[in-house]
Interface confidence: low
């Protein structure tokens, strides 16, 4: 018989390498039976995990699993770090493994097209 406990399916030591300035969605896969639990995201700061209260979040429901999504619109350098989702379920707090974001700025300043290039060579937009 399948367990009806809430489960958070973030893999241990999971990592994402993401580009600063890009939109990004960090997913917390949540499995539950009847009532959807209250889920939150927090960012690790030393030994504490600071709750992310004023960040945009949303739910994505799929057939066998749901995803609680933390939106980065867009990513900034100080988004670098480790995150954890946690669920409140029947007075129990269930915490996920942490997932780490590595923020990079891939293109160097010297590769940046000039204003003239940008306006006159629109295909640069899709490099």
């Amino acid at each position: 018989k399948e367990s009806c406990d809430v489960q958070l399916y973030i893999k241990r030591q999971s990592e994402h390498s993401i580009l600063a300035g890009d939109p990004f969605e960090l997913e917390c896969p949540v499995k539950y039976c009847a009532n959807r639990p209250h889920v939150t995201w927090c960012k690790l700061n030393g030994t504490t995990c600071v709750k992310l209260e004023d960040r945009q979040t949303s739910w994505k429901e799929e057939k066998n699993i749901s995803f609680f999504i933390l939106h980065f619109e867009p990513v900034l350098p100080n988004d670098n770090g480790s995150y954890r989702c946690s669920a409140n379920f029947q007075s129990n707090l269930i915490e996920s493994h942490s997932t780490t974001l590595y923020v990079t700025d891939v293109k160097s300043a010297s590769e940046r097209p000039s204003k003239d290039e940008m306006a006159s060579r629109p295909w640069l937009l899709y490099r």
């Epitope: 300035g21 940008m118 937009l125």
Partner: antibody, heavy 122, light 113 residues
Framework: EVQLQQSGPELVKPGASVKMSCKAS????????MHWVKQSHGKSLEWIGY????????GYNQKFKGKATLTVDKSSSTAYMELRSLTSEDSAVYYC???????????????WGQGTLVTVSA | DIVMSQSPSSLAVSVGEKVTMSCKSS????????????LAWYQQKPGQSPKLLIY???TRESGVPDRFTGSGSGTDFTLTISSVKAEDLAVYYC?????????FGAGTKLELK
């Protein structure tokens, strides 16, 4: 040539709302974050927030949450900002601006509109 | 929020003079993974929109004269104009793009003596 053409000045009464526009041309509208910046008379610049026309994603300065609403109309390459419950503190020039199309340089502003002056007065 | 402090608030200069203005941030704008400083400088002339001069603290925007130089790292930044021209009389703002909300300094006004 990249251009951001903003709507004309607005004189509005306290408590009312105002919706201003920023029409973009000379580049692919959906590829760039559209930012809005406030400049009170003789004062510095305050970042209000941005909208990403590609997916409608947006981000706001907490100070302007509930005050400003950002929207876009992709078909006309136009961004809009609505300000509500206006007070004299909202009297300012409001600019739309875009940065680059990749990396963190999306968050610097290489192109600016000419500004929309909003005056709140009874 | 990161607070950007600019000094002096105004500066009276003569044409041809070298000027420096300062911008300090309340936390470091240097990102260790790429050694870049997330700081930009803008120029705003009376009745005009701001104009981007410098990004990454020291990279000049295309078309900006080389008399404008940005320098500094971490929390202390400087904009230098090597030889001021009358057309440089304006307000200069720094802006951080390291974290939300994006913030600007209060500006340094460059005036003629």
């Amino acid at each position: 040539e990249v251009q951001l053409q903003q709507s004309g000045p607005e004189l509005v009464k306290p408590g009312a709302s105002v919706k201003m526009s920023c029409k973009a041309s000379g580049y692919t509208f959906t590829d760039y974050y559209m930012h809005w910046v406030k400049q009170s008379h003789g004062k510095s610049l305050e970042w209000i927030g941005y909208i990403y026309p590609n997916n409608g994603g947006n981000g706001y300065n907490q100070k302007f949450k509930g005050k400003a609403t950002l929207t876009v109309d992709k078909s006309s390459s136009t961004a809009y900002m609505e300000l509500r419950s206006l007070t004299s503190e909202d009297s300012a020039v409001y600019y739309c601006a875009i940065g680059d199309y990749y990396g963190s340089l999306r968050l610097t502003f290489a192109y600016w509109g000419q500004g929309t002056l909003v005056t709140v007065s009874a | 929020d990161i607070v950007m402090s600019q000094s002096p608030s105004s500066l009276a200069v003569s044409v041809g003079e070298k000027v420096t203005m300062s911008c300090k941030s309340s936390q470091s704008l240097l990102y260790s993974s790429n050694q870049k400083n997330y700081l930009a400088w803008y120029q705003q002339k009376p009745g005009q929109s701001p104009k981007l001069l410098i990004y990454w603290a020291s990279t000049r925007e295309s078309g900006v004269p080389d008399r404008f130089t940005g320098s500094g790292s971490g929390t202390d930044f400087t904009l230098t104009i090597s030889s001021v021209k009358a057309e440089d009389l304006a307000v200069y703002y720094c802006q951080q793009y390291y974290s939300y909300p994006l913030t600007f300094g209060a500006g340094t006004k460059l005036e003629l003596k």
